[in-house]
């Protein structure tokens, strides 16, 4: 990616944070071995990565969760990467689904999402899951990031 | 990525290699449809990718494995992407976990890890797994790479 | 990635399309929140991404599928990222495998593939699966893309 004043590198990698909130939107923090290249990408309210410059971005998320078929709803565990652009409807960019494990007390599984998308100035991306209480927050298990092409 | 003498492309993609070693660190080779852009990234001792230049890198690994719940330990199969920097603690960058399958003789599963990290000159990244004997080495199943932003 | 006439950004992200064809090659479309940076990458016949310029590309695919162990063959569900270069044999770049779920009527699982590869002018990449009828085409579940470094 280009260096220099005109084309600074823009990249972020943030780390999952356990939350007492009941929202399905995952929470993130600048902790551990995080990346925040500069102020052209920011973590807002601990829940969304917001970019200042229009362009193509590779956006990714990884979610590790622990669930059990009997203790969970019939529906699978779904992780969604979503986009919020000024003056636009929110939209789903990417989703992944994993059926719950039969392992007890729960079985761990990992999901990885990633794709190239055009973002507008002020656009934000965030990650939704069906059940945040099942997400694993141990070192390296759940993270979220982007890089500008 | 920038071209030219100042900013050559730096990228690598290496292919898994079965090993008789008892170590949990996976072994890799420059074989098949591998990538090694230049000597600014090297595969050392068949186990780690080492970079010469500081900067932001997107680092990824994919591991396919075949395991059975009854024949394996209670603990899930875990793949870890780890970092070694001169004079620093080794650290876990990313991890993924999958509970063993009940399929017999074993059930195949694939894990993908990827994220953006700042690497120092001389830094090395490597992949650890809980049980290397369960890793699948068929064409394309298990690989490891990086690209400099 | 480089901007300017000499080094335009090259990137694509296409969305899965259900198909009545019996082929194992997945079908894609420029629909929804797709990306097609310019005519240096094109979607051909709805099945392959073709590039005009030689270089290193990060290529990725995500496939979500729903299968059941009893209703499926013994073999796992396999997704393969394949390369077709002018005057060359086709080759497998990446593969991932997931054993079928015991959930009924079927259990959803997601696979992610990604890696850095050198492509020649006119090279095409496509995605093969063992059973296209099991692939999930809901918003964001199955996608395919690349970006030139």
């Amino acid at each position: 990616m280009q260096k220099g004043d005109q084309n600074p590198q823009i990249a972020a990698h943030v780390i999952s944070e356990a939350s007492s909130k009941t929202t399905s939107v995952l929470q993130w923090a600048e902790k551990g071995y995080y990346t925040m290249s500069n102020n052209l990408v920011t973590l807002e309210n601990g829940k969304q990565l917001t970019v200042k410059r229009q362009g193509l971005y590779y956006i990714y998320a990884q979610v590790t969760f622990c669930s059990n078929r009997e203790a969970s709803s019939q529906a699978p565990f779904i992780a969604s990467l979503c986009l919020k652009s000024p003056g636009r409807f929110e939209r789903i960019l990417l989703r992944a689904a994993n059926t719950h494990s039969s392992a007890k007390p729960c079985g761990q599984q990992s999901i990885h999402l990633g794709g190239v998308f055009e973002l507008q100035p002020g656009a934000s991306v965030f990650v939704n899951v069906t059940d945040p209480s099942q997400v694993s927050h141990g070192t390296g298990f759940t993270s979220f990031g982007l890089l500008k092409l | 990525m920038q071209k030219g003498d100042q900013n050559p492309q730096i990228a690598a993609h290496v292919i898994s290699e079965a090993s008789s070693k008892t170590t949990s660190v996976l072994q890799w080779a420059e074989k098949g449809y591998y990538t090694m852009s230049n000597n600014l990234v090297t595969l050392e001792n068949g186990k780690q990718l080492t970079v010469k230049r500081q900067g932001l890198y997107y680092i990824y690994a994919q591991v396919t494995f075949c395991s059975n719940r009854e024949a394996s330990s209670q603990a899930p199969f875990i793949a870890s992407l780890c970092l070694k920097s001169p004079g620093r603690f080794e650290r876990i960058l990313l991890r993924a976990a999958n509970t063993h399958s009940s399929a017999k003789p074993c059930g195949q599963q694939s894990i993908h890890l990827g994220g953006v990290f700042e690497l120092q000159p001389g830094a090395s990244v490597f992949v650890n797994v809980t049980d290397p004997s369960q890793v699948s080495h068929g064409t394309g199943f298990t690989s490891f790479g990086l690209l400099k932003l | 990635m480089q901007k300017g006439d000499q080094n335009p950004q090259i990137a694509a992200h296409v969305i899965s399309e259900a198909s009545s064809k019996t082929t194992s090659v997945l079908q894609w479309a420029e629909k929804g929140y797709y990306t097609m940076s310019n005519n240096l990458v094109t979607l051909e016949n709805g099945k392959q991404l073709t590039v005009k310029r030689q270089g290193l590309y990060y290529i990725y695919a995500q496939v979500t599928f729903c299968s059941n162990r009893e209703a499926s063959s013994q073999a796992p569900f396999i997704a393969s990222l394949c390369l077709k270069s002018p005057g060359r044999f086709e080759r497998i770049l990446l593969r991932a495998a997931n054993t079928h779920s015991s959930a009924k009527p079927c259990g959803q699982q997601s696979i992610h593939l990604g890696g850095v590869f050198e492509l020649q002018p006119g090279a095409s990449v496509f995605v093969n699966v063992t059973d296209p009828s099991q692939v999930s085409h809901g918003t964001g579940f199955t996608s395919f893309g690349l970006l030139k470094l």
Partner: nanobody, 123 residues
Framework: EVQLVESGGGLVQPGGSLRLSCAAS????????MGWFRQAPGKEREFVAV????????LYADSVKGRFTISADNSKNTAYLQMNSLKPEDTAVYYC????????????????WGQGTLVTVSS
């Protein structure tokens, strides 16, 4: 800044065991990780083991895997290195180090260091 004090070094025969301790003054809550490095005469300081405070995950140098075990007791603000099956090549000064929180990948945070404790493995 955290003050670190090591203890437990000494002379031991090959095949023997030692347990090193590293006591931290102040709160462990400001520490992201604690671990051990070692420096043999005429060699560079090398990583031995680390434990991360967020979930107790550990990593070891290849040369000590299966022989050394790192642990921490947060209530005592202390990290330990249990060293078994010691070999002459384990002879070195062992240093405890602590990495502060908030050390992102884009900055090389300064570690806090102990003064070191000598381990000699010889018959």
């Amino acid at each position: 800044e955290v003050q670190l004090v090591e203890s437990g070094g000494g002379l031991v025969q090959p095949g023997g065991s030692l347990r090193l301790s590293c006591a931290a003054s102040g709160s462990m809550s400001s520490i992201n990780a604690m671990g051990w490095f070692r420096q043999a005469p005429g060699k560079e300081r090398e990583f031995v083991a680390v434990i991360y405070s967020s979930d107790g995950s550990t990593l070891y140098a290849d040369s000590v895997k299966g022989r050394f075990t790192i642990s921490a007791d947060n209530s005592k603000n202390t990290a330990y290195l249990q060293m078994n099956s010691l070999k002459p090549e384990d002879t070195a000064v062992y240093y405890c180090a602590a990495e502060p929180y908030g050390s992102g990948s884009s900055l090389i945070s300064e570690y806090d260091w102990g003064q070191g404790t000598l381990v000699t493995v010889s018959s």
